[in-house]
Amino acid sequence: SERCDDWGLDTMRQIQVFEDEPARIKCPLFEHFLKFNYSTAHSAGLTLIWYWTRQDRDLEEPINFRLPENRISKEKDVLWFRPTLLNDTGNYTCMLRNTTYCSKVAFPLEVVQKDSCFNSPMKLPVHKLYIEYGIQRITCPNVDGYFPSSVKPTITWYMGCYKIQNFNNVIPEGMNLSFLIALISNNGNYTCVVTYPENGRTFHLTRTLTVKVVGSPKNAVPPVIHSPNDHVVYEKEPGEELLIPCTVYFSFLMDSRNEVWWTIDGKKPDDITIDVTINESISHSRTEDETRTQILSIKKVTSEDLKRSYVCHARSAKGEVAKAAKVKQKVPAPRYTVELACGFGAT
């Protein structure tokens, strides 16, 4: 057959679906690879063809669209499973073609099993809620397009293993779950199960997400440099090791880049000739406030090094701060015998 633009295996779209549930999977060509949509392609006379390679096999085979109850079907650019089976796992390819044009992409589909508490190998999206911030909601994700608006599904919400009922500050409201005032105790996995009828059958959609309660923007402050500070002086003799920690606290800020860096005499350590190493460690509080520590280290400090200016800098979306370390050369202690001799007027 003629050449086909092969976009390969799109591993960015590792699709995971639960066993025995409906799944609708859009051909990624129109979402990520081509500049036109399915309608345009269809009206231009292009045909969308689906095939697959089952798990642990190399053989590409057509998808069987003649299964009982139309278990697998195609509708426009969507491949439907009603419902999935465990052995549907494999790499699926959608190919758009006519006599003169061909483009195709493959993507992995994994059908996973869940346990009685909705635990599974599924990668869970994380939804961050601000602590003590007033009413916040999460919405049951990825259920659009499964049933028409005329169908009224039932939705059951769970936290871990348990139906959410009579919780003080968490209220199920259909597709939404409302947190009246989010607390650390609300951290955990939340599952919505959407149940709907279709053609005399009942289908279920299970969606689990992780809720993480984080610091509120109301309480956010610019970075705070705890060290270096005015109370600590780094007094060293030439030849000793100089270690200066820069410890900075960052309030949690959604999508903020937290940065810490040192300058020596106004330059980045990489831009100067002295043998300096910097080690960084990061820790987080329960609400994802961050403490970054960068330790500046000079193994054998010289008297020149002890005259330099060492400044720790920090930046977040809330602002930028800097603090200089107090570094000085240790004055050698006077030699005792000489002083005594001088004191007695000896020559």
């Epitope: 639960f18 066993e19 025995d20 419902p83 869940k114 346990d115 039932t154 059951t156 009942t202």
Partner: antibody
Framework: QVQLVQSGAEVKKPGSSVKVSCKAS????????MNWVRQAPGQGLEWMGR????????HYAQKFQGRVTLTADKSTSTAYMELSSLRSEDTAVYYC??????????WGQGTLVTVSS | DIQMTQSPSSLSASVGDRVTITCQAS??????LNWYQQKPGKAPKLLIH???GLHAGVPSRFSGSGSGTDYTLTISSLEPEDVATYYC?????????FGGGTKVEIK
């Protein structure tokens, strides 16, 4: 379509045990709960317990705790309910009922267990 | 355990009548209530889940409503094939418990 086929009627002596089977087809056996409910002659429905074949998790009604054992064989998609120390008041029709969540969506045809000396 | 009280225990109505069965829980069950239909000599069948969700394939003449402790099953227009015993069941708190049943007959 979902089908639950139960084993045949049993006549048992007091003090003995009975094991009723429920063979499932038409759905993913390991992804749903299997409940067991009984109905004494002319009486209402009584929930006994349930098992999740995927991980073997079980819940039992306090009344039957220690006397009932629920098991599942994933290889044959069959659930079992064993009731021990039988007495005459255990005479009933025993049903298995499948539920993806908590409601029992589909039921077996029932198994009559008669306890008589 | 949560007690479920169903009323009436039996009723007789004419074809085409509107029939209402009520179910009261001994404590709030947050709409976690199912209704089952059991015809003589047959296994029960799920009619309604989560108070008002019609199970697939169930005729639309059946509907459910309620909240807190009080729930209702309504048959808008009784048909001869609706002769059966109807059970409510709570699934708010384990163990699941059933009402005593309501036997519906045709006059």
């Amino acid at each position: 379509q979902v089908q639950l086929v139960q084993s045949g009627a049993e006549v048992k002596k007091p003090g003995s045990s009975v094991k009723v089977s429920c063979k499932a087809s038409g759905y993913a056996f390991t992804s749903s709960w299997m409940n067991w409910v009984r109905q004494a002659p002319g009486q209402g429905l009584e929930w006994m317990g349930r098992i999740y074949p995927g991980d073997g998790n079980t819940h039992y009604a306090q009344k039957f705790q220690g006397r009932v054992t629920l098991t599942a064989d994933k290889s044959t998609s069959t659930a079992y309910m064993e009731l021990s120390s039988l007495r005459s008041e255990d005479t009933a029709v025993y049903y298995c009922g499948e539920g993806y969540l908590d409601p029992m969506d589909y039921w077996g045809q029932g198994t009559l267990v008669t306890v008589s000396s | 355990d949560i007690q479920m009280t169903q009323s009436p225990s039996s009723l007789s109505a004419s074809v085409g009548d509107r029939v209402t069965i009520t179910c009261q829980a001994s404590q709030g069950i947050n709409n976690y209530l199912n209704w089952y239909q059991q015809k003589p000599g047959k296994a029960p069948k799920l009619l309604i889940h989560y108070t008002s969700g019609l199970h697939a394939g169930v005729p639309s003449r059946f509907s459910g409503s309620g909240s807190g402790t009080d729930y209702t099953l309504t048959i808008s227009s009784l048909e001869p094939e609706d002769v059966a015993t109807y059970y409510c069941q709570q699934y708010s708190i384990l163990p699941w418990t059933f009402g005593g049943g309501t036997k519906v007959e045709i006059k």
